[in-house]
């Protein structure tokens, strides 16, 4: 059987403690027991039985006195079954034993729940000897009790390789709710219901929840622990918290905010980072998420030039890293770029347009009807040509780059002219007879050379040959032209 | 199903008392508190207060504090409003509802219609 | 207290028409609650929260609203939904009621 020993109570001490079997809370003694003078243990009162020694792990001494008589049994006396607290509070318990002297070298040791205690208690043996048995005293204290120390304890003592346990003793310490579970912070869609959970436990039990929202009970009547509240919805930011209460009082949770998902803000800070004839590469501080995580972000650009048609031209790209190259875009042109981002709610507004411009690039196309005459009596190659489309230059043109090659059993030569802009025509000397002769053409500009148009070949034969037709740049999925005279 | 079902019509002189019940059946008589409401004859609705019927504790709006009272008997699961002194403006339908989370009245009574007259 | 304004006071409509009655707070609510109450009967809850329909209750009716301002919504007005609408609010005590709308079916 289990007694309680509550702290509220008082009992009469007998006699200032400690004694064998006492128990002190708050070090007022709620079992005390009398003792003759040398602190030998007298009667020692059990719950159940006063006077008996209790009947649980008991070890039989083999060994018999000089009249031959066997010694009694040995266990340890009853102590009080239970005993409860408050939390910080302290305590005192003790297991007490009669060892007849014969036996060497005893020791107790304590135990919680199972496990060995070692090491930074406060366990105290104490040694009370007589002429034939010694009462041993084991008391373990602790000054402010947790609920950590909740527990079941016993004592042990091995004699003669025989293990003797003490009945336990439970201490069960009380105190305010402890939450096992509180409420954590959510974003939620608006006026869509959601869970919020809420567990606390004692001792003592039962622990009754009330919920909390911006300062209002949402339940008037207590709910046993744990505690599902299920909210039908909101349209604003609320903040919850839950109370826990139980005999010793209340605990209130963390209060958590519940966020209402909306769309992004938008982007701030569109900057461009880097500028080439066709690119732009744009960085951007994404704004306020609305508490819904960035899916991914749009970019949208439109030609500045207010001769353009307006249209405008998105990129699509994921939120991160907040940085994007836009292609495909003219040379020497100016765009307004804007940056909006999106998350599971919705589209942020546009971010606030900058502009922009490409730098000059190479032309994108070579000049046009390139033709190749032969002037044998200057001894010349005259070229002439079409100068490639405006809007295909990419930046203002500042000439062309003639390239001929001279190709003669098994000698091949390639010169460079730089022309001027101006011009659409050119003259280059012959460099070798009875050869054949490739002209390219590529126009230049600040932002460097386009490409080369394609070859046009001319054969410029020994001295003396009559005149020849020119050579002409050939219609597209023709074979390189060679015109022989 | 849950049921709330109050006692009969009541015709009473000034300066008497009456008490109306409310009996709960359906569910558990102490998860819910019980609201008492009153409704004057071609007026609109107005909240008197609850009790908790957990704890028996009673909470009363501003203006039925004094002469009305609500209890319990949780023993058959049934709410009384008592009203002493009895004015002719007493004179109503008055509702017993349960609510849970939030106030909303889920289940409502049938209405006790107290009139007072001499 | 948080004085509930619903307006309007009575409206008569046809059958099918769509029907607004909105309920203004004196200050702002966390929620809302709708009551129908038809004569000699007790009121009967039709939305919940705000914009959460009651158990039983026909989809045409719909709630909406946050801060002071809370509309009751009846598409496509039937017959039987004769009756006088109360809104009730939460989030500060005491509870109150708005004054009710009486709805009548020409």
């Known amino acids: 059987a289990i007694t309680e020993a509550r702290e509220e109570a008082k009992p009469y001490p007998l006699f200032p403690g400690p004694f064998p079997g006492s128990l002190q809370t708050d070090h007022t003694p709620l079992l005390s027991l009398p003792h003759a003078s040398g602190y030998q243990p007298a009667l020692m009162f059990s719950p159940t039985q006063p006077g008996r020694p209790h009947t649980g792990n008991v070890a039989i001494p083999q060994v018999t006195s000089v009249e031959s008589k066997p010694l009694p049994p040995l266990a340890f006396k009853h102590t009080v079954g239970h005993i409860i607290l408050s939390e910080h509070k302290g305590v005192k318990f003790n297991c007490s034993i009669s060892v007849p002297n014969i036996y060497q070298d005893t020791t107790i040791s304590w135990w919680k729940d199972g496990k060995e205690l070692l090491g930074a208690h406060h366990a105290i043996t104490q040694f009370y000897p007589d002429d034939e048995v010694t009462a041993i005293i084991a008391s373990f204290s602790i000054t402010s009790v947790q609920r950590s120390d909740n527990g079941s304890y016993i004592c042990k003592m091995k004699i003669n390789n025989e293990e003797i346990v003490s009945d336990p003793i439970y201490i069960e310490v009380q105190g305010l709710p402890h939450f096992t579970k509180q409420p954590e912070s959510m974003n939620v869609t608006r006026n869509t219901a959601f869970n919020l959970t809420c567990q606390a436990v004692g001792p003592p039990e039962p622990v009754n929840i009330f919920w909390v929202q911006n300062s209002s009970r949402v339940n008037e009547q207590p709910e046993k622990s744990p505690s599902v509240l299920t909210v039908p919805g909101l349209t604003e930011m609320a903040v919850f918290s839950c109370e826990a209460h139980n005999d010793k009082g209340l605990t209130v949770s963390k209060g958590v905010q519940i966020n209402i998902k909306a769309i992004p803000s938008p982007p701030t800070e569109v900057s461009i980072r880097n500028s080439t004839a066709h690119s732009i590469l744009i960085s951007w501080v994404p704004g306020f998420d609305g508490y819904s995580p960035f899916r991914n972000c749009s970019i949208q650009v439109k030609e500045a030039d207010p001769l353009s048609n307006g249209s405008v031209m998105i990129f699509n790209t994921s939120a991160l890293p907040h940085l994007y190259q836009i292609k495909q875009l003219q040379a020497l042109a100016n765009y307004s770029i804007g940056v909006s981002c999106m998350n599971e709610i919705g589209w942020s507004a546009v971010s606030p347009w900058i502009l922009a411009s490409t730098t000059e690039g190479a032309p994108s196309v070579a000049p046009l009807n390139v033709t190749v005459f032969l002037n044998e009596s200057s001894d010349n190659v005259d070229i002439r040509w079409m100068k490639p489309p405006t809007k295909q230059q990419d930046g203002e043109l500042v000439g062309y780059r003639i390239s001929h090659v001279w190709q003669s059993a098994g000698i091949s030569k390639e010169l460079l002219e730089e022309v001027g802009q101006n011009g659409s025509r050119a003259r280059i000397s012959v460099q070798v007879h009875n050869a054949t002769c490739t002209v390219r053409i590529a126009a230049v500009t600040r932002g460097g050379v386009g490409p080369f148009s394609d070859p046009v070949k001319i054969f410029i034969p020994a001295h003396g040959w009559v005149d020849y037709a020119p050579s002409s740049t050939p219609a597209p999925g023709n074979a390189d032209p060679v015109l022989i005279i | 199903q849950i049921q709330l079902v109050q006692s009969g019509s009541e015709l009473k002189k000034p300066g008497a008392s009456v008490k109306v019940s409310c009996k709960a059946s359906g569910y558990t008589f102490t998860n819910y508190g019980m609201n008492w409401v009153r409704q004057a004859p071609g007026q609109g609705l107005e909240w008197m207060g609850w009790i908790n019927t957990y704890t028996g504790e009673p909470t009363y709006a501003d203006d039925f504090k004094g002469r009305f009272v609500f209890s319990l008997d949780t023993s058959v699961s049934t709410a009384y409003l008592q009203i002493s002194s009895l004015k002719a403006e007493d004179t109503a339908v008055y509702f017993c509802?349960?609510?849970?989370?939030?106030?909303?009245?889920?289940?409502w009574g049938q209405g006790t219609l107290v009139t007072v007259s001499s | 207290e948080i004085v509930l304004t619903q307006s309007p006071d009575f409206q008569s409509v046809t059958p099918k028409e769509k029907v607004t009655i909105t309920c203004r707070a004196s200050?702002?609510?966390?929620?809302m609650h709708w009551y129908q109450q038809k004569p000699d009967q007790s009121p009967k809850l039709l939305i919940k929260a705000t914009s959460n329909l009651a158990s039983g209750v026909p989809s045409r009716f719909s709630g909406s609203g946050s801060g002071t301002d809370f509309t009751l919504t009846i598409n496509s007005l039937e017959a039987e939904d004769a009756a006088t609408y109360y809104c009730?609010?939460?989030?500060?005590?005491?509870?109150?009621f708005g004054q009710g709308t009486k709805l009548e079916i020409k």
């Open positions: 009730q609010q939460w989030g500060t005590k005491p509870l109150t």
């Open positions: 200050s702002s609510v966390s929620y």
């Open positions: 509802a349960t609510y849970g989370h939030y106030a909303w009245f889920a289940y």
